[in-house]
Interface confidence: low
């Protein structure tokens, strides 16, 4: 999987969005996890309705958001009040049973500075990325990050790489 | 006023070990990722890698991965990079940059000459 | 990774003329396309971030345009001072790349 790089502003809210196939995924309920090192686990952070048939609405924990467009294909992530604690290497995931299918790996990075948009304050602009495999930004800030790259970076934004 | 400055030149035999250094200031050292790029005489820039002074997250270009090491020291707001069993492929100027919206801060470079 | 063609490798100008530099992405990377300048023995300076956008202290007669795979960075009414190399960056995906670079020259 190619890393996605999302930059965001802390203090800002960052919108990670995770395309994926609407029929392959179709019925299944969708997660957010943060990876717990290079190799280690990925912890869930959020995940949609129980309900699939209500995965249209948002669910938070805490500062983090997700709801999911079953029709269109896209998972959307809010990170509310990016902090810098929040950069690092994330995943939105396809559940099924008890697996799990990657549909994107994320960079999160976190900037400090908000004169350092791109221009207009609600848009969202990538960022740098951690030691991962292909990574690439998206409009929304993202950007992929390279094979080997490890995720731990600081604020983001989202922007495919803008 | 942001400034990166780089260690000193630094002449090295083949086979040993380098360590170079970026010391930043005008700025908060931890909020923003610092990269590396590699420029060999007379030729382009390659991106090296980076790392997230915040928690010492790192980043690495496939090709320098097992030759790069970088680390930072915060209380000193201070980043290194450390390339290990250096050939003549190594020699090169080495940069140090600021992250942000495309590199807007450079190191001077530290040049880097690996010689028997 | 993503492969970033420069073109032409080099050229001369006249002082006034307005040049026209090209970077080529082998795929598309939006805008995520920044723009460098490096004299003889100094560290590369940022002109042009994401593909058009201004960078504060650089000349306005520097300028970015292009998205996709295909930018240019134009300079209108070149000054001597301008010499150097230019370099486009991908900004889009890791591992970050560069051009090749133009080495831009004086008559």
């Known amino acids: 999987h190619n890393t996605t790089v999302f930059q965001g502003v802390a203090g800002q809210s960052l919108q990670v969005s995770c395309p994926y196939d609407s029929m392959k995924h179709w019925g299944r309920r969708k997660a957010w996890c943060r990876q717990l090192g290079e190799k280690g686990p990925c912890q869930r952070v959020v995940s949609t309705h129980n309900l699939w048939l209500l995965s249209f609405l948002r669910r938070w924990n805490g500062s983090t958001a997700i709801t999911d467009d079953t029709l269109g294909g896209t998972l959307t992530i809010t990170l509310r009040n990016l902090q810098p604690h929040d950069a690092g290497l994330y995943q939105c995931q396809s559940l099924h049973g008890s697996e799990a299918d990657t549909l994107r790996k994320v960079l999160v990075e976190v900037l400090a500075d908000p004169l350092d948009h791109r221009d207009a304050g609600d848009l969202w602009f990538p960022g740098e990325s951690e030691s991962f495999e292909d990574a690439h930004v998206e409009h929304s800030i993202s950007r992929s990050l390279l094979e080997g790259e490890i995720p731990f970076p600081p604020t983001s934004h989202h922007h495919h790489h803008h | 006023e942001v400034q990166l400055q780089e260690s000193g030149p630094e002449l090295v035999k083949p086979g040993a070990s380098v360590k170079m250094s970026c010391k930043a200031s005008?700025?908060?050292?931890?909020?923003?990722?610092m990269h590396w790029v590699k420029q060999s005489h007379g030729k382009s820039l390659e991106w090296i890698g980076y790392?997230?002074?915040?928690?010492?997250?790192?980043g690495y270009n496939q090709k320098f991965k097992g030759k790069a090491t970088l680390t930072v020291n915060k209380s000193s707001s201070t980043a290194y990079m450390e390339l290990r069993s250096l050939t003549s492929e190594d020699s090169a100027v080495y940069y140090c940059?600021?992250?942000?919206?495309?590199?807007?801060?450079w190191g001077q470079g530290t040049l880097v000459t690996v010689s028997a | 990774d993503i492969v970033m063609t420069q073109s032409p490798a080099s050229l001369s100008v006249t002082p006034g003329d307005r040049v026209s530099l090209s970077c080529r992405a082998s795929?598309?990377?939006?805008?995520?396309l920044h723009w460098y300048q490096q004299k003889s023995h100094e560290s590369p300076r940022l002109l042009i971030k994401?593909?058009?956008q201004s960078i504060s202290g650089i000349p306005s007669r520097f300028s970015g345009s292009g998205s996709g795979s295909d930018f240019t960075l134009s300079i209108n009414s070149v000054e001597p001072e301008d010499v150097g190399v230019y370099y486009c960056?991908?900004?889009?995906?890791?591992?970050?790349?560069f051009g090749g670079g133009t080495k831009l020259e004086i008559k």
């Open positions: 940059a600021r992250s942000g919206r495309g590199f807007a801060y």
């Open positions: 005008g700025y908060t050292f931890t909020d923003y990722n």
């Open positions: 790392i997230y002074p915040n928690n010492g997250g790192t």
């Open positions: 795929q598309s990377i939006s805008d995520y």
């Open positions: 994401y593909a058009s």
């Open positions: 960056q991908n900004g889009h995906s890791f591992p970050y790349t």
